[in-house]
């Protein structure tokens, strides 16, 4: 997260980290006791999922292995359209004040809405500084028309843009798959942006979750 600050303790109890061994790979969100939602470009063969603490490496955190993951069938490694994936935990997460399910959206929020993006990704770019504490930054949803002015034909209709004009506030490497939460509901998953991260007027691009709620629910049901 570029130009952000540590999240208020316990304010993101649905936030998870996907680890490869002990190394941060991506962010994600807890959908229910068995399922984590993240970005399709975060796919690995096996995951260790960190839940229940804002601090990576916290021994009080839950760590659950996951071996099965289901990319959206329409995901493209060229355009990165449909960049979302469900990861099935090998054992159930224990819900608590620090481990809660995210609220999936019932509607798409409009441009101008203030949202929070969070993650343990690098806070500097191109040199990297990985924080141990979960970082947050507020950004505003940007209309597809305005975002297309920047990204032209790279932007697909299930992609959502967010940023602050003339500001560095953005996501970065390591934040992928993590949540963009607006008015208490999950509206986006960190997908991509320009490099180095935090270039003013280059919005972050997110998978627009409100377009995929049916696929999310159907996939969890199918692979119960």
């Amino acid at each position: 997260i570029i130009d952000g600050a540590p999240c208020a303790r316990g304010s993101h109890p649905w936030q998870v980290a996907l680890l490869s061994g002990n190394q941060l790979h991506c962010g994600g969100v807890l959908v229910n006791e068995r399922w984590v939602l993240t970005a399709a470009h975060c796919k690995m063969n096996e995951y260790t999922v960190h839940l229940g603490s804002d601090t990576l490496g916290d021994r009080r955190a839950q760590r659950i292995k996951a071996s099965k993951s289901f990319r959206h069938p329409g995901y493209s490694t060229q355009t990165h359209v449909n960049d979302l994936m469900l990861v099935k935990l090998n054992s159930q997460a224990r819900l608590s004040s620090m481990v809660k399910k995210v609220r999936l959206p019932s509607r798409c929020e409009p441009p101008g809405t203030t949202c929070t993006v969070s993650g343990w990704g690098t806070t500097t770019s191109p040199d990297v500084t990985f924080p141990s504490d979960l970082m947050c930054v507020d950004v505003k949803l940007i209309s597809p028309q305005d975002c297309t002015k920047v990204y032209k034909d790279l932007l697909e209709n299930s992609m959502l843009c967010a940023g602050i004009p003339d500001s560095k506030k953005n996501a970065c490497n390591g934040d992928s798959g993590g949540p963009l939460v607006c008015r208490g509901t999950l509206q986006g998953l960190v997908s991509w942006g320009t490099f180095p991260c935090g270039q003013p007027n280059d919005p972050g691009v997110y998978t627009q979750v409100c377009k995929f709620t049916k696929w999310i629910n159907d996939t969890m049901k199918k692979h119960r």
């Epitope: 190394q23 970005a39 470009h41 490694t77 060229q78 355009t79 990165h80 960049d83 690098t122 770019s125 191109p126 040199d127 990297v128 034909d153 790279l154 996501a171 970065c172 490497n173 934040d175 992928s176 960190v190 997908s191 991509w192 942006g193 320009t194 490099f195 991260c197 691009v205």
Partner: antibody
Framework: QLQLQESGPGLVKPSETLSLTCTVS??????????WVWIRQPPGKGLEWIGS???????YYSPSLKSRVTISVDTSKNQFSLKLSSVTAADTAVYYC???????????????????WGQGTTVTVSS | DIQMTQSPSSLSASVGDRVTITCRAS??????LNWYQQKPGKAPKLLIY???SLQSGVPSRFSGSGSGTDFTLTISSLQPEDFATYYC??????????FGGGTKVEIK
């Protein structure tokens, strides 16, 4: 600004291992989120990608060379290196090291262009 | 593997000419294409990244366009220092990274 410099023997015997080092100055190989790349160019021919290594020390190799190539990083010396085993005359080329600048973050971090290059070092395979 | 085909392989042009070089990918590569200039005995130099973005310090007479499978490098008004070999390069999600065969721009 960032500079890259290749070093290693200019002459290698057939069946031996070619070893080259790229020294990075003006920047840190251990703290920058770039790819570090080896490319070669046989005499009078085009450019051929050999392989790359990223910030996380993940390696990516050309399928045609994969069985013979090892790329590694020595962060204490700010260097990365190339080893190519069982060389033949077909491995005679100018070898370049380069920095791969990602075209984006997240899903677009896997794509890159080489924005800084070493001047190249000529390696001849001959007995 | 994705093959990159450049055309023409060589061309002769005069100072001030508009020069166009094309690069075709064997399958769609979105906009993940870069262009390089190489002068004899020198390392390549990045000119254009992401199909159309001009690398810092490169003169504005160079431009790139295209997406999917067909890409173009244009030099709007050829200068004496532009006589060189030009390569396109695709940056894949899965290796290998591949270059086109090169286009040599010579003085007419």
């Amino acid at each position: 600004q960032l500079q890259l410099q290749e070093s290693g023997p200019g002459l290698v015997k057939p069946s031996e291992t070619l070893s080259l080092t790229c020294t990075v100055s003006g920047g840190s190989i251990s703290s920058d989120d770039y790819y570090w790349v080896w490319i070669r160019q046989p005499p009078g021919k085009g450019l051929e990608w050999i392989g790359s290594i990223d910030y996380y020390a993940s390696t990516y190799y050309s399928p045609s060379l994969k069985s013979r190539v090892t790329i590694s990083v020595d962060t204490s010396k700010n260097q990365f290196s190339l080893k190519l085993s069982s060389v033949t005359a077909a491995d005679t080329a100018v070898y370049y090291c380069a920095r791969g600048r990602p075209l984006g973050y997240g899903a677009k971090h896997y794509y890159y262009g080489m924005d800084v290059w070493g001047q190249g070092t000529t390696v001849t395979v001959s007995s | 593997d994705i093959q990159m085909t450049q055309s023409p392989s060589s061309l002769s042009a005069s100072v001030g000419d508009r020069v166009t070089i094309t690069c075709r990918a064997s399958q769609s590569i979105s906009s993940y294409l870069n262009w390089y200039q190489q002068k004899p005995g020198k390392a390549p130099k990045l000119l254009i990244y992401s199909a159309s973005s001009l690398q810092s310090g490169v003169p504005s007479r160079f431009s790139g366009s295209g997406s999917g499978t067909d890409f173009t490098l244009t030099i709007s008004s050829l200068q004496p220092e532009d006589f060189a070999t030009y390569y396109c390069q695709q940056s894949p999600y899965f290796p290998p990274l591949t270059f086109g065969g090169g286009t040599k721009v010579e003085i007419k």
